[in-house]
Interface confidence: low
């Protein structure tokens, strides 16, 4: 599979239930573990922080206890376990530990983990929320005035928001330079499409949307083939039924269907 | 202990310096004030640390203008890149110079880098189908205001437009929406007091263009003339995928 | 792809200078740290100095502190090594080395990279003789 | 500093054996341990990192270990290609320091 490097981590829960959030700030001899939560429109907080040396938690006073418990499956690794969750526990949760920097200096700057979503909620959700694909292929316009052509994945019906996608090559694993939109929510779940255009040069090879994303089947990153394509010129016989839809650029529906 | 930073978003163009305001509230003193940056993927890059007993710090194109007596640290975003765009912490750290200090956060400050002014650029439209799925693809434009408009007589649903910079420091924009009768849809942009339309755009020639996917050993095109293309979308890691020409 | 290319090796007499270079490609000298390690003829490997680009930090094995000094000019994309008061027993083969990243935030809580080096140069031969 | 004592400097062994090369650390250094192999002149080349993870493209029946301060080096089957010097590293701590070298000669 594909590797997508970087934040867009996340973790949905049901009311009630307990959440593990791993940190990936990966610190060697770190004495203290600080967990922090960002909720949007409001500042980051502490919530406690983790001694190593004595295996001991502090919580951030007003915090009840029995609610934060960071979890150290072996050395230099921790997870935070929270229990009994509320929807108001949803949000970016942060590790962090202080880098000492120069050791002539008492401390230098705090350094953060990339962050995990936790989204906590009471929606019934369909059992699969895994990002739906449908592809657009260029259309023949473009092609034949810019000598440039735009790919378009369109993902749907997926849940939560947190979503990567980039794209490559086929036999390529360097990231092209792409765009998207906003994740849009529709009813309880969200769309989202990003596009790329190449050169014409580039239209005769396959090209590969790649979607990170929670709920992917199996955990692993979806890939999208975009064939490649190339410009035709075909005669048409205008009495031919089928000429309506002939101009149109080639239909490839993708659909999804649960299992 | 307080931290307030009271421009909630600020927007600039590249090239240009942008200052982001931050007041602070405390008893102590001596402190330390950080600069965060956020990322849209959510990770928070460490940018600066201003000292309360030291000169203005500086790094690279990040400078702070630390006011002890005012409370206040102000940073400076010298010579804009649109990779700038993204939310920024103004943070106080305890006086302890302990492992064990917390970081009080402001709310954050969401800087939004636009391109540089320049002439005024008329797009391109072209659309995009399948199935009931149409895409108005918009490219190259100046100034960013447009308006996009998807006509059918049969509308489904439309989308929100992306309105996006483009590597060329223009704009570009992609409306979605779902209709009964795709083949018949349009696109029709206002955009500095002119309408463009898709069509405009069309190839006029006497035979019927497509684009299609290139043949491989997977990709077989029947003869007949008026073909759909069939593609093979390899689809291991996507749930019962089915693909209709 | 990854290079390291060290140059300015030779002979030199005891007491003079020498300014060894490493030029890097494929990657930044200001996002990584480099390193140098000798090996004198037929002897075993010996850690010389690293610098952090970044922050500017250097540091040096005991034997030649106040006599090297690492810097990096990170528009040329190269580290030197600049050896005054040279001695025989500084007679080695110079190589200059790049830490491995294998985790997108590594840091040790003394503020340099904790990681072990991964791309080397070819080396460069320094012999101090008169 | 830390010293990296290193056993044994030298040993021969056949193509298909079992060879172990042990580091002892004189203080603590985490899993900040690194194994090398150098052939005559040629630069070093990365085997295991973090004491015992494998280095990509390293071939597998190369493999390490910690117990306390005592770091170990295992080839579990001897290729003609595995015969060179083998250096064991600290990188926890300043100044790096290096093992004295493991020869590996043909029996």
């Known amino acids: 599979s594909s590797n997508l490097e970087g934040g867009t981590k996340s973790v949905t829960r049901p009311t009630r239930s307990s959440a593990e959030i791993t940190c990936d700030l990966t610190v060697i001899n770190a004495f203290y573990i600080h967990w922090y939560l960002h909720q949007e429109g409001k500042a980051p907080q502490r919530l406690l922080y983790y001694d190593v040396s004595n295996s001991k938690d502090v919580l951030e006073s007003g915090l009840s206890p029995g609610k934060y418990y960071t979890h150290t499956p072996r050395r230099w690794s921790w997870i935070l376990i929270l229990r009994n969750l509320i929807e108001n526990d949803s949000g970016v949760y942060y590790c962090a530990t202080w880098d000492r920097g120069n050791p002539k200096t008492h401390y230098y700057k705090k350094l953060f983990g990339s962050g995990t979503t936790l989204v906590v909620t009471d929606k019934q959700l369909d059992a699969d929320v895994s990002p739906k694909p449908t592809i657009f292929l260029p259309s023949i316009a473009e092609t034949k005035l810019q000598k440039a052509g735009t790919y378009l994945c369109l993902l749907e019906k997926f849940f939560p928001d947190v979503i990567k996608i980039h794209w490559q090559e086929k036999k390529s694993n360097t990231i092209l330079g792409s765009q998207e939109g906003n994740t849009m929510k529709t009813n309880d779940t969200y769309m989202k499409f990003s596009w790329l255009t190449v050169p014409e040069k580039s239209l005769d090879k396959e090209h590969r949307c790649i979607v990170r994303h929670e709920n992917n089947k199996n955990g692993v990153d979806q890939e999208i083939i975009f064939p490649p394509i190339k410009t035709d010129v075909i005669t048409m016989d205008p009495k031919d039924n089928c000429s309506k839809d002939a101009n149109d650029t080639l239909l490839l529906q993708l659909t999804n269907t649960s299992a | 202990q307080k931290v307030t930073q009271a421009q909630s978003s600020v927007s600039m163009p590249v090239r240009k310096a942008v200052t982001l305001n931050c007041l602070y509230e405390t008893s102590w003193w001596s402190y330390y004030i950080f600069w965060y940056k956020q990322l849209p993927s959510k990770e928070m890059i460490f940018l600066i640390r201003q000292g309360s007993d030291e000169q203005n710090a500086k790094s690279g194109r990040y400078s702070v203008n630390f006011k002890k007596a005012a409370k206040s640290v102000a940073l400076t975003i010298s010579a804009l890149q649109l990779e700038d765009s993204a939310k920024y912490f103004c943070a106080l750290g305890d006086p302890g110079g302990l492992n064990t200090d917390k970081l009080i956060f402001g709310k954050g400050t969401r800087v939004t880098v636009e391109p540089r002014s320049q002439p005024h650029t008329k797009p391109s439209v072209f659309v995009m189908k399948n199935g009931t799925n149409v895409a108005c693809l918009v490219k190259e434009f100046y100034p960013k205001d447009i308006r996009i408009n998807l006509v059918s007589s049969k509308k489904i649903t439309e989308f929100d437009p992306a309105i996006v910079i483009s590597p060329s420091g223009k704009y570009n924009a992609v409306k979605l929406g779902k209709y009964e009768d795709s083949n018949s849809v349009t696109c029709s942009v206002q955009h500095d007091n002119k309408t463009v339309h898709s069509t405009d755009f069309e190839v006029k020639t006497d035979s019927t263009d497509h684009v299609k996917p290139k043949e491989t050993e997977n990709t077989k095109q029947p003869s007949k003339s008026c073909h759909k293309p069939k593609a093979i979308v390899h689809t291991e890691k996507v749930n019962m995928m089915s693909l209709t020409v | 792809e990854v290079q390291l290319v060290e140059s300015g090796g030779g002979l030199v007499q005891p007491g003079g200078s020498l300014r060894l270079s490493c030029a890097a490609s494929g990657f930044t000298v200001s996002s990584s740290s480099i390193h140098w390690v000798r090996q004198a003829p037929g002897k075993g490997l010996e850690w010389v100095a690293s610098?952090?680009?970044?922050?500017?930090?250097?540091y040096y094995a005991d034997s030649v502190k106040g006599r090297f000094t690492i810097s990096a000019d990170t528009s040329k994309n190269t580290a030197y090594l600049q050896m005054n008061s040279l001695r025989a027993e500084d007679t080695a083969v110079y190589y200059c080395?790049?830490?491995?990243?294998?985790?997108?935030?590594?840091?040790?809580?003394?503020?340099?990279?904790?990681?072990?080096?991964?791309?080397w140069g070819q080396g460069t031969l320094v012999t101090v003789s008169s | 500093d830390i010293q990296m004592t290193q056993s044994p400097s030298s040993l021969s062994a056949s193509v298909g054996d079992r060879v172990t090369i042990t580091c002892r650390a004189s203080?603590?250094?985490?899993?900040?341990v690194a194994w090398y192999q150098q052939k005559p002149g040629k630069a070093p080349k990365l085997l295991i990192y973090?004491?015992?993870s494998l280095y990509s493209g390293v071939p597998s029946r190369f493999s390490g270990s910690r117990s306390g301060t005592d770091f170990t080096l295992t080839i579990s089957s001897l290729q003609p290609e595995d015969f060179a010097t083998y250096y064991c590293q600290q990188y926890g701590e300043y100044p790096i320091t290096f093992g004295q070298g493991t020869k590996v000669e043909i029996k």
């Open positions: 610098i952090y680009s970044s922050s500017g930090y250097t």
């Open positions: 080395a790049r830490p491995y990243y294998w985790y997108p935030y590594y840091y040790w809580s003394g503020g340099w990279e904790y990681a072990a080096f991964d791309y």
């Open positions: 203080q603590s250094v985490s899993s900040a």
């Open positions: 973090s004491a015992s």
